[in-house]
């Protein structure tokens, strides 16, 4: 039993860290493997994560690691029975993948604009709450060439969109993802798309 690609881990920096690795042959991850993890701090408990299969030979483990602080480092050990396959360490603050923004909604707004709103996926208590910036992708459902990307670098999870920048009568979909620049994070997963009809008519037609 061998590890082909060693575990790669990311933390949402609030409740969960996820590690994924690839074995050298198809493996029943939950039956054959265990990932043990322990905060590298005197007196910390040793925990065991039972991995699941993502693909035939790809295993994934979700570990409840909450209230992470910057200095936290976890010792990880991957076991196949009594055999230690891999040993390493993981610092959640250096491997952040933010949670997905939620509840993306589109509202008609004053003066021919659309207001896109979503929720910050972190409570105020969390260190990431005030650190997120967002990317919004707006695409025409019937024209793959007609898409726009907006970077929302201010604090509020909102974007105002002039209806005139979109094709009149076309159906558009938007989705949003987040990242934490100060943590040099990866991007979050995209939110589910929300769709609306752009019924703006150019002024000359009136």
């Amino acid at each position: 039993v061998k590890v082909l690609h060693e575990p790669s881990c990311f933390s949402d920096y609030i409740s969960t860290s996820v590690c994924q690795w690839k074995m050298d042959h198809p493996t029943n991850c939950s039956a054959e493997l265990r990932l043990s993890y322990q905060l590298d701090f005197m007196g910390s408990e040793n925990h065991t994560c039972v991995p699941e299969n993502r693909e035939d030979s790809v295993c994934v483990c979700s570990m409840p690691i909450d209230d992470a602080v910057e200095a936290d480092v976890y010792q990880l050990d991957l076991w196949a029975g009594q055999q230690l396959l891999w040993s390493g360490s993981f610092q959640p603050s250096k491997h952040v993948k933010p949670r997905t923004p939620g509840n993306l909604t589109v509202y008609p707004n004053i003066s021919h604009t659309w207001l896109l709103m979503w929720t910050n996926p972190y409570p105020t208590e969390n260190h990431l709450h005030s650190e997120l910036t967002y990317m919004v992708n707006v695409s025409n459902d019937n024209d793959p060439e007609d898409f726009k990307v907006y970077n929302v670098t201010y604090m509020g999870p909102t974007l105002r969109l002039a209806a005139s920048t979109l094709k009149s009568g076309a159906s558009y979909s938007a989705r949003v993802r987040a990242w934490a620049q100060t943590y040099n994070s990866t991007w979050s997963d995209w939110s589910p798309s929300t769709t609306w009809l752009n019924y703006y008519e150019p002024w000359e037609q009136h």
């Epitope: 105020t124 208590e125 100060t182």
Partner: antibody, heavy 118, light 112 residues
Framework: EVQLVESGGDLVKPGGSLRLSCVAS????????IHWVRQAPGKGLQWVAR????????KYNEKFKSRFTISRDNAKNTLYLQMNSLRAEDTAVYYC???????????WGQGTLVTVSS | DIVMTQTPLSLSVSPGEPASISCKSS????????????LAWFRQKPGQSPQRLIY???TRESGVPDRFSGSGSGTDFTLRISRVEADDAGVYYC????????FGQGTKVEIK
């Protein structure tokens, strides 16, 4: 306007149990973690526990983990603190509190007094 | 656990005079990535619930007079009142939430 209203405080004998409630209004209950903080007579503030109403995830001050249980009922916008094996030193005003849209405990209830005495 | 230590524990100040309260934490409250210190200051008047005055060590809560200011970083923090008024009497607490939540013992401010 955000409001937190505690109730359930009472006089109870040592070894007894009590359940405190905190009704939240004026905001979406599931959007903010909510906490219990206590204050013994003439003493300072002590954080007890918190809950994420959305997921039900909880965290406790280790001092209270074995005797106190925090829970919530999202349908009623209500936070609870179940206190068992009460001791004289648990006599305190118990507050529920919530962060604001910025960092820190911005909103507090008026508190409810728990007295443990024989 | 992070321990918060306030000094002095009591303070008697004449109206118009400045006042200063120190708060020290047993470990740094500075997140080197966000550059924020996870420290807040509260005032509790007799018979009332605590009121947040300052967060992130130096950001004043809206509605709090600019006589109040917070400073410091890492483990040493200070709350200053530039000119004390009669209404400022009460117990002042610092609180960390860098790792869970701990309050200082409180400083009782009395107006002469």
């Amino acid at each position: 306007e955000v409001q937190l209203v505690e109730s359930g405080g009472d006089l109870v004998k040592p070894g007894g149990s009590l359940r405190l409630s905190c009704v939240a209004s004026g905001y979406t209950f599931t959007n903010y973690w909510i906490h219990w903080v206590r204050q013994a007579p003439g003493k300072g503030l002590q954080w007890v526990a918190r809950i994420d109403p959305n997921s039900g995830g909880t965290k406790y001050n280790e001092k209270f983990k074995s005797r106190f249980t925090i829970s919530r009922d999202n349908a009623k916008n209500t936070l609870y603190l179940q206190m068992n094996s009460l001791r004289a030193e648990d006599t305190a005003v118990y507050y529920c509190t919530r962060f604001g849209s910025t960092y820190g405990f911005a909103y507090w209830g008026q508190g409810t007094l728990v007295t443990v005495s024989s | 656990d992070i321990v918060m230590t306030q000094t002095p524990l009591s303070l008697s100040v004449s109206p118009g005079e400045p006042a200063s309260i120190s708060c020290k934490s047993s470990q740094s409250l500075l997140n080197s990535r966000t550059r924020k210190n996870y420290l807040a200051w509260f005032r509790q008047k007799p018979g009332q619930s605590p009121q947040r005055l300052i967060y992130w060590a130096s950001t004043r809560e809206s509605g709090v007079p600019d006589r109040f200011s917070g400073s410091g970083s890492g483990t040493d923090f200070t709350l200053r009142i530039s000119r004390v008024e009669a209404d400022d009497a009460g117990v002042y607490y610092c609180k960390q939430s860098y790792n869970l939540y701990t309050f200082g013992q409180g400083t009782k401010v009395e107006i002469k």
